[in-house]
Interface confidence: low
């Protein structure tokens, strides 16, 4: 079973959220779904098959950044029926691909902060405990991915987290893998790749919601990154 | 508040190596992950490579893909980068840097906090 | 690849003056500003193109976007003769422009 990396986004009603989606690979169909209540199905929001959901015209637009392997949707005059659970995904079917779980809460009033909000204790970076060891689900691979920095980045195979020579097509604002190569014995860590960008963002420490130029309001963090597939975000 | 206490001043041969360090203090939740950036004597900066924990992936700039190294030690909050094959074009400060593309500060995308740096000097 | 101009630039206390960055090809938004006095690590100024700093002075103004990219600062003080340096993430190699030195007249 794939545990889909899950985050959480809050937006002030009138107001508008932009959801960060990992963009996994060139020339294929990428979107946003809601699931819908009790059928478990997603039914899409926005595609880049030109479609949109009726009551999210002319409030909902889908921007890819390929070089940053991201692509983002942005949803205008929130209201409180847009509240719900969303999954960002790619390919054509489109409860298959989804590779991010969203979940969106428009509200009425914006609290003032982060910091002013009580919050669990967030990890330290040093100190998660599967940042240099071998968590119990990996593969028996030693390898991590060593990655270069060609100038231009062609079209690369997915990623394989069973092989030591792993590539990474990956690359969300928030990882900089790019291409290729394994050729230093590290600890590997395969629970995750590059492409996460939204359950990386946010992912040790809370954000203001005032460094999206963006949108009025924005606040994404992870909720989920510890049970992730190698190969999510391959769509 | 980060802080990154860099190691001291280093001497080394042509075609030897050298491990430099980083260490993390303060509040260590907000790092995202660690660049290293050298800048040679009367020279601009230029980025070598960075180490982003989750996933864990090291990413080089190409000139260095084949001599530098970088690592961490959980235990003592310490990123370590170690640059092979030195030559005198290699002598520069070393600096890292937060990395500040994720966590805290994913909208900055940018060095935002920077060790005092370590000059490192290869001659024979 | 990054490049600035001018490399080199006099001014007094009080004026105003403008450095440029541009990118080989489109960077977006993604461009930095740093500032760098000698024997010192540099200073992020500008972030995101136009986002200033917390704790910069507001007399660093950032602005562009894609290609080309300009550092104002207006009503120069004493501690901002220094060297400035342009960097983009938008790629994977981080690349830094040449630096901009600017010297008291």
């Known amino acids: 079973l794939r545990i889909l990396p899950e985050v959480k986004v809050e937006g002030e009603l009138g107001g508008s959220v932009t959801i960060k989606c990992p963009l996994p690979e060139m020339h294929v169909r990428i979107y946003l779904c809601r699931e819908m209540a009790g059928s478990g199905t997603c039914g899409t929001v926005v595609s880049t098959t030109n479609f949109i959901k009726a009551e999210y015209k002319g409030r909902v637009t889908l921007k890819q950044y390929p070089r940053k392997n991201l692509f983002l949707v942005e949803v205008t005059q929130l209201t409180e029926s847009d509240s719900g659970v969303y999954a960002c995904g790619a390919g054509m079917n489109t409860d298959r691909g989804k590779t991010q779980k969203v979940t969106l809460n428009v509200h009425s009033e914006y609290e003032p902060s982060w910091e002013e909000q009580p919050m669990p204790e967030t990890p330290k970076w040093f100190h998660l405990p599967y940042l240099f060891q071998m968590p119990a689900y990996a593969s028996s691979s030693k390898f991590v991915t060593r990655v270069t920095t060609p100038a231009q980045r062609g079209k690369v195979p997915p990623v394989h987290h069973s092989s030591p020579t792993t590539q990474i097509t990956h690359r969300p604002r928030v990882s900089r893998a790019s291409s290729v190569a394994g050729d230093k014995p590290r600890t590997f860590l395969p629970s995750t790749t590059a492409s996460k960008i939204s359950a990386l963002e946010g992912l040790l420490k809370p954000q203001t919601p005032s460094y999206n130029h963006h949108t009025r309001l924005h606040r994404q963090r992870a909720l989920d990154y510890g049970s992730q597939s190698g190969r999510e975000g391959q769509g | 508040q980060v802080q990154l206490q860099q190691s001291g001043a280093e001497v080394r041969k042509p075609g030897s190596s050298v491990n430099v360090s980083c260490k993390a203090s303060g509040d260590t939740s907000s790092i995202y992950a660690i660049s290293w950036v050298r800048q040679a004597p009367g020279q601009g900066l230029e980025w070598m490579g960075r180490i982003n924990p989750i996933p864990r992936i090291t990413t080089y700039a190409q000139k260095f893909q084949d001599r530098a190294t970088i690592t961490a030690d959980i235990s003592t909050s310490t990123v370590y980068m170690d640059l092979s094959s030195l030559t005198s074009e290699d002598t520069a400060v070393y600096y890292c840097a937060r990395d500040c593309s994720g966590g805290s500060c994913f909208r900055q995308d940018a060095f935002d906090i920077w060790g005092q740096g370590i000059m490192v000097t290869v001659s024979s | 690849i990054l490049s600035q101009a001018p490399l080199s630039l006099s001014a007094s206390i009080g004026d105003s003056v403008t450095i440029t960055c541009r990118a080989s090809?489109?960077?977006?938004?993604?461009l930095n500003w740093y500032q760098q006095k000698p024997g010192k690590a540099p200073k992020l100024l500008i972030y995101?193109?136009?986002s200033l700093q917390s704790g910069v002075p507001s007399r660093f103004i950032g602005s562009g976007s894609g290609t080309d990219f300009t550092l104002t600062i207006s009503s120069l003080q004493p501690e901002d003769f220094a060297t400035y340096y342009c960097?983009?993430?938008?790629?994977?190699?981080?690349?830094f422009g040449q630096g901009t030195k600017l010297e008291i007249q």
């Open positions: 960097q983009q993430s938008y790629t994977t190699a981080y690349t």
């Open positions: 995101a193109a136009s």
């Open positions: 090809q489109s960077v977006s938004d993604y």
